[in-house]
């Protein structure tokens, strides 16, 4: 008789990342008997929910159930039926929902309530939907990349898992860019974290980590663009905004009511003598960069040093993984290579922004115009944020690694969130155990 393959003893977990611009569902898988080992959890599926972020459903909450259906059904297919009931499902909402909650706690709560009711209808072990803090978002992103890079493992390896991995136990810093917020998280070198709000203490696998983190609400790429437009339209002489952050020949009509539909533009709000204005691109990197810098208040710092807006930032230390929109934007611009210097990135951005819109549309015919039109701004914003906001230099630029995936798992906060909630990162180093039964099979 033929040997029957024993069913693999694996577990699954689902995390939904409810971001400001969209929601993504991630499915993770790991060997059941190795839960406390580092690096054993990996992503088996990502499903991007069609439509906007959940905060946009505030006036139509009854549509949330349908919105989540396709990806939840995909999870049903991917995860074996026998595992459904024991597969935890977590939903974490980020800055889009933080902004909605600033406007009204009830509105945010109503959206989450419908999300919870929708997710409870599936056969999985639903564990709740909540708005995670910016601090958590930064911390879990840092845990994710260092877990995947094997930085928490006490075993030193003679080989490298990933091209940019230095073979030591120094953790990587985490740079996360979303649509509505951006996070910076790293272990400073022997530096006191001067503001308690930015300090995190972890004990992971028997080692203590003093981590700095900050989340800048309203400084994700989409909200930063709204801020820039609101700032610039204040000084426009008429309803035409000649904008250096868009390609020459690009035109778009913006409703003033949409411009002020976010708490992020409140500081620039004023009565304009028109209901709409037209963006006319002029495609000038340098001017775009200058305009973006005006969003960062660097004139005030109550600490030894600051990022911007009076927020403490210790001196940068070590290597950094830059992921989410940092990666997506730079990947589109073909600027993720380790060999590309900061000067070269700036040079290429100057050329890209100066390209006529008609030429750009032809060159990237398969890309949606809404996204395509914003890469000049987004690329320039990334440079401005990293260089002037976080004080990276031409020299330290080489310590930034633009990361999409590590070992097949997306870099981002979701894996760290699940590892924490399923207690899969022990405080102490697990004792090496004898071979489990499954190893003998």
């Amino acid at each position: 008789t033929q040997n029957k393959a024993l069913p693999e003893n694996v577990k699954y977990g689902i995390v939904l990342d409810a971001g400001s611009s969209h929601t993504s569902l991630y499915i993770y898988k790991w060997p059941a008997e190795k839960e406390n080992d580092t690096g054993v959890v990996h992503q088996v599926e990502e499903c991007r929910v069609k439509g906007p972020g959940i905060s946009k459903f505030v006036q139509k909450v009854n549509e949330i159930g349908i919105y989540l259906t396709d990806c939840m059904e995909r999870a049903r297919e991917v995860i074996p039926r026998s595992q459904h009931q024991e597969t935890p499902v977590y939903l974490g909402a980020t800055a889009g929902m933080r902004l909605l909650r600033m406007e009204s706690e009830e509105l945010a709560d109503r959206v989450l309530d419908v999300v919870e009711r929708s997710l409870s209808n599936y056969p999985f072990d639903f564990q709740g939907a909540r708005i995670i803090t910016g601090q958590e978002e930064g911390a879990y992103g840092w845990i994710t990349i260092n877990y995947l890079l094997g930085k928490f493992s006490q075993k030193t390896r003679w080989f490298s898992i990933v091209p940019y991995e230095t073979n030591n136990q120094e953790t990587f810093g985490a740079l996360d860019l979303g649509g509505a917020s951006t996070q910076v998280t790293f272990v400073p070198q022997n530096q006191t974290i001067e503001s308690p709000d930015n300090a995190l203490q972890f004990r992971l696998y028997g080692k203590d980590y003093n981590v700095y983190t900050h989340s800048f609400l309203c400084y994700g790429k989409d909200q930063a663009l709204w801020q820039k437009l609101a700032k610039d339209i204040q000084v426009a002489s008429n309803e035409i905004l000649r904008d250096p952050c868009f390609h020459p020949g690009y035109k778009k009509v913006v409703n003033v009511s949409d411009l002020y539909k976010t708490p992020c533009t409140k500081r620039f709000e004023m009565t304009l003598p028109f209901q709409q204005f037209e963006i006319q691109g002029i495609g000038n990197y340098q001017q775009c960069h200058q305009s973006i810098l005006e969003l960062f208040n660097t004139s005030y710092c109550p600490y030894s040093q600051c990022a911007f807006n009076g927020i403490f930032l210790p001196p940068l230390q070590g290597d950094f993984g830059a992921f989410s929109a940092f990666y997506f934007v730079m990947k589109f611009l073909n600027l993720t290579s380790e060999k590309v210097s900061q000067e070269k990135v700036t040079e290429m951005m100057k050329k890209f922004c100066a390209q006529p819109w008609e030429e750009i549309k032809t060159s990237y015919a398969g890309v949606k115009e809404k996204y395509l039109s914003e890469y000049c701004f987004s690329g320039t914003y990334i440079l401005s944020l990293l260089l002037q906001g976080y004080h990276f230099t031409a020299d330290s630029w080489e310590h930034i690694h633009f990361i999409g995936k590590i070992q097949g798992s997306d870099a981002g906060w979701t894996l760290g969130y699940m590892l924490n909630l399923t207690n899969m990162i022990p405080a102490e180093q697990p004792l090496s155990t004898p071979l489990s039964h499954s190893t003998y099979v």
Partner: antibody
């Protein structure tokens, strides 16, 4: 000191229109949601319409939906209620009320009220 | 819509006594329940927000409790200025008020 002052009320015939205004002072107007609440003579309070701080959420009571329009001008620190196709049952004292806050978050309760403006719909 | 039912419609109490006013929601409203006081010829005044939080400038003899569908406003020791009409309001759905409880001098 927070102040809300309503104006624009008066006697109007059924089917006609009226525009109410609320002038706000003593707080950063664009940081707060604003509302209209009405009270018919000798009756209880009835919420009419809300306009959240960033205009993400604009809502109306079923009794006025399609007839009334709420708007705000943050630069003028003003809230408005355009009332069309008025009916006898719209007769009430109309209050302008500010949304409260739960710490850093907005709340759909009413922490400050104006003294109201009377609207009488009668032929 | 969420219907709010206040009881009793009228409550007669002597000064110095305790007054307990009830409000029931037709569906769960979490802790999004608020209480107002209104005196004749005046605008309503916020007393309690989010079920149990005392509004600014309101005396500590006022307190609120409850969650879900059942809520209570308690005035521990009635003062002469407390005789008025009291309204509850939910904000879990679009705002709705109770019909009011008239607190009168016994």
């Amino acid at each position: 000191e927070v102040q809300l002052v309503e104006s624009g009320g008066g006697l109007v015939q059924p089917g006609r229109s009226l525009r109410l205004s609320c002038a706000a002072s003593g707080f950063t107007f664009n940081n707060y949601g604003m509302n209209w609440v009405r009270q018919a003579p000798g009756k209880g309070l009835e919420w009419v319409s809300s306009f959240s701080s960033s205009s993400t959420y604009i809502s109306y009571a079923d009794t006025v939906k399609g007839r009334f329009t709420i708007s705000r001008d943050n630069a003028k620190n003003s809230l408005y209620l355009q009332m069309n196709s008025l009916r006898a049952e719209d007769t009430a004292l109309y209050y302008c009320a500010r949304h409260g806050r739960y710490g850093g978050y907005g709340g759909f309760y009413f922490d400050y009220w104006g003294q109201g403006t009377m609207v009488t719909v009668s032929s | 819509e969420t219907v709010m039912t206040q009881s009793p419609a009228t409550l007669s109490v002597s000064p110095g006594e305790r007054a307990t006013l009830s409000c029931r929601a037709s569906e769960g409203v979490k802790s999004y329940m608020h209480w107002y006081q209104q005196k004749p010829g005046q605008a309503p005044r916020l007393l309690i927000y989010k079920a149990s939080n005392l509004a600014s400038g309101i005396p500590a003899r006022f307190s609120g409790s409850g969650s879900g569908t059942e809520f209570t406003l308690t005035i521990s020791s009635l003062q002469s200025e407390d005789f008025a009409v009291y309204y509850c309001q939910q904000s879990w759905n679009d705002p709705t008020f109770g019909q009011g409880t008239k607190l009168e001098l016994k």
